[in-house]
C-alpha cells in the first residue's frame, strides 16, 4: 500500500510531459489575485517644509489577477535532468474585487525626485538635475493615478533630462508583456527530492546582488517543494519579487477544503538584523541607513533595482525596527494581516495555498543640491504600497486532490 | 593620488581652433564630474563648463557656448577641450579640475597656456 | 546667473595679524560657498568648501562663515606663506561663479 503510493506521488510530481504536477505547473489552476494598498500621503507640505512625521493613510485594496499565464519556452533537458522556462507576467484589474477605479488618485513620493540624488550623488550633476525639477515643477511628493503609481507614467522631470534615460517610472513598470526568468528547475526524473529546486536563473547560479552566501538561488519558486514534506523541514525558496532567496519554517496544521496541509510561516528571523541574526550579515550592504546594521526589518533592493533607491519589508513594517518605522505616522503592524505564509499539502509537497505579503518603501534623503529636498532633516523609508498576493486550490481541484491523493492514503 | 596632467602651452592664429586635453589618473575617471576653467593675463576666474564622463552630460556657461566644446575618452580617462574661432580674447590659462562628489574643484591639472596671436 | 562681488579687491597686511575677504552674492546661496588659494605660477587649491568645511590639511587658522547671501573668509595670525590671491567660488547654481579675487601682500 504505502510503497505503491510513494511510488506514484515520486512518478506524479515529476516535471514532465504527462503527470499530474507538470500539467498543473505549466499553466497554475489557482486564481491568483493581487492586492494592493497605497500609502497616500496626508501632510506632504508639511514634510517637504518641515522635515515633519509623514502621515500616511493606506486606501485599498486595489485587486489584480496574475500569474494567469502559462509558461513559456518549456524545454526539458535530459541530460542534466532540467526543464527551462519563462513565466509571463499580466495584470487584470477586478473592479469588483476593489474599493475604486484605476483612476484613483493618490498623493505618493515623487520617486523620480527620490532616486536622482541617490543615483547621481555628484553635485555638478545634482545642480543640473535641480533645475530641471524646478522647471518641470516637480517636488517631493505627487498625485498620481492607481495605474500610473503601479504601471508607468512618463515622468516630467525624467523627460526633461538631455541624455538618453527612461522617462517612465512606476513601481512595477515594465511589467504587462514581460517575463519573469528564464528559470531553470530540476524536474526530479533522476532524485526526487530535488525536483521544482532551481538550478539556475537568468543562466546564472548567483544573484550577482548580494556578498557571500546571501547570493545564492536557494529551493524552489514556492509554488511546489519536494515530496514527503516533514514539519521539522526548512522550506527555502526564491523570489525574484524580493531579489534573494528566503525561507519558510513549520507553523501549524490546518485543514484546507478537507485537505490536511502544513502552514509554513516567514520568521521574524529572516527579517532580523546580523545583530539578531549572524546569517543575515550579507544582507545588511550599506552601513549609514541600516544604522551601522543594527536595523531590521527592510532590505535593500538597489543593487536589484538599477540603483534606485528601492527597499523591501513587510507591510506596515511588520518585525522592523523601530527606528525605521519612527518617522511614519498612520502604521498598524499586525502579524495575521501582513504575515507570508504557504500551505504546503506535505505528501506531494504542493503549495495549495499561500499568501505573499510585502511592502515597497523608496528612501528619500536630504540634498543639498535639490531644493525639494534640501529642507529634510532626516532620511526616511517612505512606505508607497504594500500588496497581499493571494491563491487557494478551487474547490473542484481539491475534491480531484482528495479522491487522487489524500483519499488514498487514508 | 589623483593627478591631472594638461597638455602643452599653445599658439595658434586667430580664426584657427585649439583642442586641449587634461589626463587623469588614481580615480575611476567615470564618477567625477571635469570642469574647464579660465583664467586670462592678471584676472579672475571663469566656469567654462562641465562633463560628467559617466553619461556624457555636459553644461555650459552660456558665455561659452558655440566657444567650447567639452568631450571625454572614458578609454584613456582623458577629458578634452576645443575652442574654435580664437580671438585675442581667448588668450589666457586654462585649467581642468575634478569634483570629489560634493567638493567642487577638488584636483585641478596644472593649466594650458593659449596664446592666440597672429 | 548669480554674481559674486569679492572685496577687498587686494590688501596688505602685517605678519601675524588677521585678514577678513568678504564676498556677495546677488541671490540667497544657502552656504554653498568655496573658498580657493592661488599663489603665483600654480593653480587654486581649495580650501574651505559648502557648509564652511575646512578641507583636510589646510591648516586650522583658516576659516569662513556666511548663509545666504553674505560671507566672509578669516585667516588668523598671517603667515608669509599665505601670500596669494584668494577666491570665491559659489556653487549653489549654474553657471558656478567666482568672486573677482583678492591679492593679499604682506607689508
Known amino acids: 500500500g504505502d510503497m505503491l503510493i510513494e511510488k506514484t506521488i515520486k512518478r506524479e510530481v515529476v516535471l514532465e510531459e504527462g503527470t499530474t504536477a507538470f500539467k498543473n505547473w505549466v499553466k497554475t489552476g489557482t486564481t491568483v489575485y493581487r492586492q494592493f494598498w497605497i500609502f497616500d500621503v496626508q501632510n506632504p507640505d508639511d514634510v517637504a517644509k518641515n522635515s515633519s512625521k509623514i502621515k500616511v493613510k493606506q486606501r485599498g485594496p486595489y485587486t489584480y489577477r496574475v500569474r494567469y499565464l502559462a509558461k513559456e519556452n518549456i524545454t526539458q533537458d535530459p541530460e542534466d535532468h532540467t526543464v527551462s522556462f519563462v513565466q509571463p507576467n499580466g495584470a487584470i484589474f477586478e473592479p469588483s474585487l476593489s474599493v475604486g477605479t484605476e483612476d484613483d488618485n493618490f498623493t505618493v513620493l515623487n520617486l523620480a525626485v527620490a532616486a536622482a540624488p541617490h543615483i547621481y550623488q555628484n553635485s555638478f550633476v545634482q545642480v543640473v538635475l535641480n533645475s530641471l525639477i524646478k522647471k518641470s515643477k516637480s517636488s517631493m511628493f505627487q498625485t498620481r493615478s492607481l495605474k500610473e503609481l503601479l504601471w508607468g507614467y512618463k515622468d516630467p522631470f525624467l523627460s526633461l533630462v538631455p541624455y538618453p534615460i527612461s522617462t517612465t517610472v512606476g513601481v512595477f513598470y515594465p511589467y504587462n508583456d514581460t517575463v519573469d526568468g528564464v528559470y531553470k528547475v530540476f524536474n526530479g526524473k533522476d532524485n526526487i527530492s530535488k525536483v521544482a529546486i532551481i538550478e539556475s536563473y537568468k543562466g546564472k547560479r548567483n544573484l550577482s546582488y548580494w556578498p557571500s552566501y546571501c547570493d545564492m538561488i536557494n529551493g524552489t519558486d514556492a509554488a511546489s517543494f519536494p515530496p514527503f514534506v516533514e514539519k521539522s523541514r526548512t522550506l527555502r525558496f526564491f523570489s525574484s519579487d524580493i531579489c534573494r532567496s528566503i525561507y519558510a519554517v513549520f507553523g501549524s496544521e490546518i485543514d484546507l477544503k478537507g485537505i490536511p496541509v502544513y502552514r509554513f510561516v516567514l520568521p521574524a528571523n529572516a527579517f532580523a538584523s546580523p545583530l539578531q541574526n549572524p546569517d543575515n550579515h550579507c544582507f545588511c550592504t550599506e552601513k549609514v541607513i541600516s544604522n551601522n546594521c543594527t536595523s531590521y526589518g527592510v532590505l535593500d533592493i538597489g543593487k536589484c533595482k538599477e540603483g534606485k533607491p528601492v527597499y523591501i519589508s513587510l507591510p506596515h513594517f511588520l518585525h522592523a525596527s523601530p527606528d525605521v518605522s519612527e518617522p511614519i505616522e498612520g502604521l498598524h503592524p499586525n502579524e495575521d494581516e501582513h504575515r507570508t505564509y504557504l500551505d504546503v499539502e506535505p505528501i506531494t509537497g504542493f503549495t495549495l495555498q499561500f499568501a505573499k505579503r510585502l511592502q515597497v518603501n523608496i528612501l528619500v534623503k536630504p540634498a543639498r543640491k535639490i531644493e525639494a529636498l534640501k529642507n529634510l532633516k532626516r532620511p526616511y523609508i517612505v512606505p508607497i504600497l504594500w500588496l497581499n498576493e493571494t491563491g487557494t486550490i478551487g474547490d473542484e481541484k481539491a475534491e480531484m486532490f482528495k479522491t487522487q491523493v489524500t483519499g488514498k492514503i487514508k | 593620488e589623483v593627478q591631472l596632467q594638461q597638455s602643452g602651452p599653445e599658439l595658434v592664429k586667430p580664426g584657427a581652433s585649439v583642442k586641449i586635453s587634461c589626463e587623469t589618473s588614481?580615480?575611476?575617471?567615470?564618477?567625477?564630474?571635469m570642469h574647464w576653467v579660465k583664467q586670462s593675463h592678471g584676472k579672475s576666474l571663469e566656469w567654462i563648463g562641465g562633463i560628467y564622463p559617466n553619461n556624457g552630460a555636459t553644461k555650459y556657461n552660456q558665455k561659452f557656448k558655440g566657444k567650447a566644446t567639452l568631450t571625454v575618452d572614458k578609454s584613456s580617462s582623458t577629458a578634452y577641450m576645443e575652442l574654435r574661432s580664437l580671438t585675442s580674447e581667448d588668450s589666457a590659462v586654462y585649467y581642468c579640475a575634478r569634483d570629489r562628489y560634493d567638493v567642487w574643484f577638488a584636483y585641478w591639472g596644472q593649466g594650458t597656456l593659449v596664446t592666440v596671436s597672429a | 546667473e548669480t554674481t559674486v562681488t569679492q572685496s577687498p579687491a587686494s590688501l596688505s597686511m602685517a605678519i601675524g595679524e588677521k585678514v577678513t575677504i568678504r564676498c556677495i552674492t546677488s541671490t540667497d546661496i544657502d552656504d554653498d560657498m568655496n573658498w580657493y588659494q592661488q599663489k603665483p605660477g600654480e593653480p587654486p587649491k581649495l580650501l574651505i568648501s559648502e557648509g564652511n568645511t575646512l578641507r583636510p590639511g589646510v591648516p586650522s587658522r583658516f576659516s569662513s562663515s556666511g548663509y545666504g547671501t553674505d560671507f566672509v573668509f578669516t585667516i588668523e595670525n598671517l603667515l608669509s606663506e599665505d601670500v596669494a590671491d584668494y577666491y570665491c567660488l559659489q556653487s549653489d547654481n549654474l553657471p558656478l561663479t567666482f568672486g573677482g579675487g583678492t591679492k593679499l601682500e604682506i607689508k
Open positions: 588614481g580615480h575611476t575617471f567615470t564618477e567625477y564630474t
